[in-house]
Interface confidence: low
């Protein structure tokens, strides 16, 4: 631009563009000032007067330097399955994200339009892939030797306990039940090793040929729930 052109509005030289934070007004054929975030153009510029800006009203915003005649409306209040992570101000829209235990099934430019509950894996199934902010849980059937007896979006399949004498064999949805002899657990990651190991061998077959006796009513169950997987997930 020529040195003498300092203030808006001004006519740009042919082929040149307006400066930063200015816009070309097609009606006035002039470079004019943009309005700052939180404002909008109340009166557009003319050949002799610059843009007149005004503050956005309540529940409206502009996030960028602009020359819009009206501020944008903030999105509606967050729904019950959402958390407001950014409030509506004159310079930014409200942002709603999904609350814990939910994921975003339909996203928008910022935040989430539609949240959905994370899938819960039913007994016999464990979490194969945890849920994230934008993806649901993926469940998988528990493999032989593992089980899940919960309906959960976080629990994975855990290994059956290993008994010296099995009272009831485990399946995909139930742990093995041992006789009154203290059970041991396989050394799978995250598995709990209970006291009184019966043998250094981990095996699912009975170590002695005697038939099992009737189960005791005071058999040991796994100690506490398995640690939750990262994020959350389901069926």
């Amino acid at each position: 631009l020529p040195a003498q052109v300092a203030f808006t509005p001004y006519a740009p030289e042919p082929g040149s563009t307006c400066r930063l934070r200015e816009y070309y007004d097609q009606t006035a054929q002039m470079c004019c000032s943009k309005c700052s975030p939180g404002q909008h153009a109340k009166v557009f510029c003319t050949k002799t007067s610059d843009t007149v800006c005004d503050s956005c009203e309540d529940s409206t915003y502009t996030q960028l330097w602009n020359w819009v005649p009206e501020c944008l409306s903030c999105g509606s209040r967050c729904s019950s399955d959402q958390v407001e992570t950014q409030a509506c101000t004159r310079e930014q829209n409200r942002i709603c994200t999904c609350r814990p235990g939910w994921y975003c099934a339909l996203s928008k430019q910022e935040g989430c339009r539609l949240c959905a509950p994370l899938r819960k894996c039913r007994p016999g199934f464990g979490v194969a892939r945890p849920g994230t902010e934008t993806s649901d849980v993926v469940c998988k059937p528990c493999a032989p030797g593992t089980f899940s007896n919960t309906t959960s979006s976080t629990d994975i399949c855990r290994p059956h306990q290993i008994c010296n004498v099995v009272a009831i064999p485990g399946n995909a949805s139930m742990d093995a039940v041992c006789t009154s002899t203290s059970p041991t657990r396989s050394m799978a990651p995250g598995a709990v090793h209970l006291p009184q190991p019966v043998s250094t061998r981990s095996q699912h077959t009975q170590p002695t040929p005697e038939p099992s006796t009737a189960p005791s009513t005071s058999f040991l169950l796994p100690m506490g729930p398995s640690p939750p997987a990262e994020g959350s997930t389901g069926d």
């Epitope: 006519a11 740009p12 042919p14 070309y24 097609q26 009606t27 054929q29 050949k47």
Partner: antibody
């Protein structure tokens, strides 16, 4: 580089309709308005009007209100001039040009209206 | 609307000769713009905002004026300057053009 390329010559009969296109390239189409200018044989230029390529709002000179209409296909960076119910006196070369004083004009489209 | 009257309508000049084309407005305008057109081509912006030469225009051209009286001057005519020149105002709606001055080389 910036270019405005217009559609080819047209031969029409009175009463018919013609639609002339002006395809812009080399710049963001919605940043500059588009004007249309008429040049009749042996005469000077007459300004038909202009269209705001951002809002789509057209403005016509008094002499061209009614049968002349501007339109846009923003996705194709193209402006159109449509003239309906053609008359012999519409015979002219029609130019599109950027409405910003930069001096970019199309090559012109010759329209001949004759029975 | 503002009427622009150019004079002369046609003129011829010898190489090296000084040429002046005038444009008179029916009402005062802020600026005058000039276009050059050669047969079979679209008009080219030649001088904008009264006195600024458009890109690629030789320095022998100049523009001046104010109010209702404007002019385009060629200090030394050259063969390539033979063309029709049009003045245009955009200060008042609608924009209008002069009738043109056809400049020929002798």
């Amino acid at each position: 580089q910036i270019q405005l390329v217009q559609s080819g010559p047209e031969l029409k009969k009175p009463g018919e309709t013609v639609k002339i296109s002006c395809k812009a390239s080399g710049y963001t189409f919605t940043t500059a308005g588009m004007q249309w200018v008429q040049k009749m044989p042996g005469k000077g230029f007459k300004w038909i009007g202009w269209i705001n390529t951002h809002s789509g709002e057209p403005k016509y000179a008094e002499d061209f209100k009614g049968r002349f209409a501007f339109s846009l296909e923003t996705s194709a960076s193209t402006a159109y001039l449509q003239i309906s119910n053609l008359k012999n006196e519409d015979t002219a070369t029609y130019f599109c040009a950027r409405w910003d004083g930069t001096g970019y004009w199309g090559q012109g489209t010759t329209l001949t209206v004759s029975s | 609307q503002i009427v622009l009257t150019q004079s002369p309508a046609i003129m011829s000049a010898s190489p090296g000769e000084k040429v002046t084309i005038t444009c008179s407005a029916s009402s005062s305008v802020s600026y005058m713009h000039w276009f050059q057109q050669k047969p079979g081509t679209s008009p080219k912006l030649w001088i904008y905002s009264t006195s600024n030469l458009a890109s690629g225009v030789p320095a022998r051209f100049s523009g001046s004026g104010s109010g209702t009286s404007y002019s385009l001057t060629i200090s030394r005519m050259e063969a390539e300057d033979a063309a029709t020149y049009y003045c245009q105002q955009r200060s008042s709606y609608p924009p209008t053009f002069g009738g043109g001055t056809k400049l020929e080389i002798k």
